[in-house]
């Protein structure tokens, strides 16, 4: 099992749309997946949690944050629209 | 079985309209992102736009923007390319497909513009 | 917007040949892209995705590689039915593009 992460580190304009991809490899057919963030202050985050019929995001990505579980493509991509500079933090995707 | 087919070919008059459809089976557009793409006569691939029929947001490329227009009908799992003042430029087979990368492909929906 | 440029515009190759076919970007797009074979009247078709990685169904002989803004799609050992057309495409920004295409002749 695996997962990948594409994006090279992101360097935006705010208001702008920014996909972050994340890619996974597993013999399960319903996988839990998350996206987490650690920001410059190294507070660690949720941020978003989906498997295959649903997806679900912490009270501060109401609005500009979704995530895009393309099953076809085994991808579970964190959609940040618009982005904002507080959202400048290292994002990892996990299952 | 994941498919994408496509409207039949179109022949219209410059200055005219056109609406191509792309319908998706065996996944949900919902789910994904639908790109449509220009391919000219003896020419390369351009890509036209995307929508993410979700929340019905788009993006194109500039060159494109004001000429076409891409919409998405979830109910019947279908993505739209509507082309507006159509020249002889607009000749050409266009290609629906989905995801990031392109996995899946329409069989391409060949326009030819003439008078 | 991202410039794919393709070298060189047709590769002549004979059957058994390895083949490479180079697309540059003109900005840093990490390995955020992809490689598509088009047959004659046939719609383009998938061979590999973030660079490097394989896709079920398409043959061994086809391989990717690089980072950055320099790419290779390779060929091992060229048959008749791989006479087509290839392009690069990336993903990493707005708008999408794809390079301007090879064409590979079997000599």
């Known amino acids: 099992d695996k997962v990948t992460q594409s994006s090279p580190d992101q360097t935006v304009a705010s208001g702008s749309e920014v996909v972050l991809l994340c890619t996974y490899d597993t013999v399960y057919s319903n996988p839990d997946l998350f996206w987490y963030r650690i920001r410059p202050d190294y507070s660690f985050q949720f941020v978003f949690y989906g498997d295959n019929s649903r997806s679900e995001g912490a009270d501060f990505t109401q609005g500009r944050f979704s995530v895009k579980h393309i099953l076809t493509q085994k991808a579970f991509h964190l959609v940040i629209s618009p982005v904002r500079t507080e959202d400048s933090a290292t994002y990892y995707c996990a299952f | 079985e994941v498919q994408l087919q496509q409207s039949g070919a179109e022949l219209v008059k410059p200055g005219a309209s056109v609406k191509l459809s792309c319908t998706a089976s065996?996944?949900?557009?919902?789910?994904?992102?639908m790109h449509w793409v220009k391919q000219r006569p003896e020419q390369g691939l351009e890509w036209i736009g995307r929508?993410?029929?979700?929340?019905?947001?788009?993006k194109y490329d500039p060159k494109f923007r004001g000429k076409a227009t891409i919409t998405a009908d979830t109910s019947s799992n279908t993505a739209y390319l509507q082309l507006s003042s159509l020249t002889s430029e607009g000749t050409a087979v266009y290609y629906c497909?989905?995801?990031?990368?392109?996995?899946?492909w329409g069989q391409g929906t060949t326009l030819t513009v003439s008078s | 917007d991202i410039l794919l440029t393709q070298s060189p515009a047709i590769l002549s190759v004979s059957p058994g040949e390895r083949v490479s076919f180079s697309c540059r970007a003109s900005q840093n797009i990490g390995t955020i892209i992809h490689w598509y074979q088009q047959r004659a009247n046939g719609s383009p078709r998938l061979l590999i995705k973030?660079?490097?990685e394989s896709i079920s169904g398409i043959p061994s002989r086809f391989s990717g590689s690089g980072s950055g803004t320099d790419f290779t799609l390779s060929i091992n050992s060229v048959e008749s039915e791989d006479i087509a057309d290839y392009y690069c495409q990336q993903s990493n920004s707005w708008p999408y593009t794809f390079g301007g295409g090879t064409k590979l002749e079997i000599k």
């Open positions: 929508i993410d029929p979700a929340n019905g947001n788009t």
């Open positions: 065996g996944f949900n557009i919902r789910d994904t992102y």
């Open positions: 973030y660079a490097s």
């Open positions: 497909s989905e995801g990031i990368y392109f996995d899946y």
